[in-house]
């Protein structure tokens, strides 16, 4: 057994209920809200996390628009419908039968409609731009050190392979992390960039989803990197369909 299995907790998701009722008495963890069994060696999907979070909703995420096709998450938190794999269902509806289509990170990408609304497919968010502003430091961080540290962080903490970290841009005090991942690029076991971005966002807000691990302690050559604000831009493989400019 791993240490996590010995005390039966889920290292990658504290919003779970765990018990030793898996095969051979092994620790098995289920996401709150949905009861879906999760793999605690990797990130839990954002859909299951949002479902679990609905028991104690926090402030909504804000997305900023880098171009005409970017989405702004003005709708805040909602209780999502997830498919058996834990992904967002393409169509989401609320209790009053208002429905809308979402992308793979659960952000609305169409006007709201009624139960007759059709969402043919779950459109993939293939490009995520994480825009950070760090607190003032004695001097600027070395760009290549910063790049290496962020790639290491995304691999070790979020299990995202560095191939999906397309670039790290830096103009003090702004850091931009570009994540790119087409559907065809994902191999078995590869973490989804949307899930990695969501975990990272929660970490920088001081709302870590990890069990028993300390909060995010980002250092570049020993110098603490403290994030003041985060903005996340999501771009889909197919542009969103709204009836008018928002």
């Amino acid at each position: 057994h791993t240490a996590a299995q010995d005390n039966c907790t889920c290292p990658t998701n504290k919003m779970t209920v765990c018990s030793p009722d898996g095969p051979g008495g092994r620790c098995q963890c289920r996401a709150l809200g949905s009861g879906v069994a999760v793999d605690c060696s990797t990130l839990t999907s954002e859909c299951l996390l949002l479902k679990a979070r609905m028991s104690a909703p926090k402030n909504a995420r804000t997305l900023v628009r880098p171009n005409e096709h970017a989405l702004v998450d003005n709708d805040g938190l909602y209780d999502p419908d997830c498919d058996p794999e834990g992904r967002f269902k393409a169509r989401q509806c609320n209790q009053t039968s208002v429905c809308w289509c979402v992308n793979s990170v659960g952000v609305r990408r169409t006007d709201k409609g009624d139960l007759s609304l059709r969402c043919d497919e779950l459109v993939r968010t293939h490009h995520i731009l994480i825009d950070l502003r760090h607190r003032p430091t004695a001097g600027a961080f070395n760009h290549s050190d910063l790049d290496a540290e962020l790639r290491r962080l995304f691999r070790e903490r979020y299990r995202l392979h560095p191939k999906f970290v397309a670039a790290v841009h830096y103009e003090q005090p702004t850091i931009q992390i570009e994540l790119r991942q087409n559907t065809s690029q994902k191999a078995a076991g590869d973490v989804d960039i949307g899930d990695a971005a969501y975990y990272f966002e929660r970490d920088v807000k001081g709302e870590s989803l990890f069990q028993g691990r300390g909060g995010l302690d980002l250092r570049v050559r020993g110098e603490p990197l403290q994030v003041e604000r985060t903005l996340i831009y999501y771009l889909d493989e197919i542009p969103p369909k709204f009836s008018m400019k928002r």
Partner: antibody, heavy 119, light 108 residues
Framework: QVQLQQPGAELVKPGASVKLSCKAD????????MHWVKQRPGQGLEWIGE????????SYNQKFKGKATLTVDKSSSTAYMQLSSLTSEDSAVYYC????????????WGQGTTLTVSS | DIQMTQITSSLSASLGDRVTITCRAS??????LNWYQQKPDGTVKLLIY???RLHSGVPSRFSGSGSGTDYSLTISNLEQEDIATYFC??????????FGGGTKLEIK
Amino acid sequence: QVQLQQPGAELVKPGASVKLSCKADGYIFTSYWMHWVKQRPGQGLEWIGEITPSDNYTSYNQKFKGKATLTVDKSSSTAYMQLSSLTSEDSAVYYCTRGHGNYVSFDYWGQGTTLTVSS
Amino acid sequence: DIQMTQITSSLSASLGDRVTITCRASQDISNYLNWYQQKPDGTVKLLIYYTSRLHSGVPSRFSGSGSGTDYSLTISNLEQEDIATYFCQQGYTLPPYTFGGGTKLEIK
């Protein structure tokens, strides 16, 4: 079932290049990472590099940069590793192995190709 | 790079014995530790992944445990077919992924 087929042996002269092959069967070739591992006689295992067949992304152990080049042919579900400027230090068994993105565990291995560099 | 150390390079045991092979990482690898068996003919097989998960088709006499930097592979009831060299490997950090030096298991 999953199979990775490699030729048993290759004999090449010092200074030459060789292209080792690894034919994948029993799974969707583009859905898994492919890794290559070196084992010198009586020694341990050494990771050379990895490739994703879907987009030809490669990453190498610094030690093998310039020595090994990984490629794939999706149409035949075959991975290749070219080794250049061969010396006696390159004489070894070379394994191809299928990898998992999260655990980075190598769940199926080829039988290995024994490369002998000799004049 | 993370160094993986298998202090015991060879081990002698009797059939039916309980055998434990250990592996130490140069830093915390958060359970991303895998174990492989290499038979004398060179055939390599995955036994255990993510510290303690048994790969499909592997007999239940094999088990893994550990955390942080220290990990172990246990064979609960040694059989003749288990005579092989065993390697640990970490998949935690950025490439390169590294292996231990191996532990050769022999029959007394």
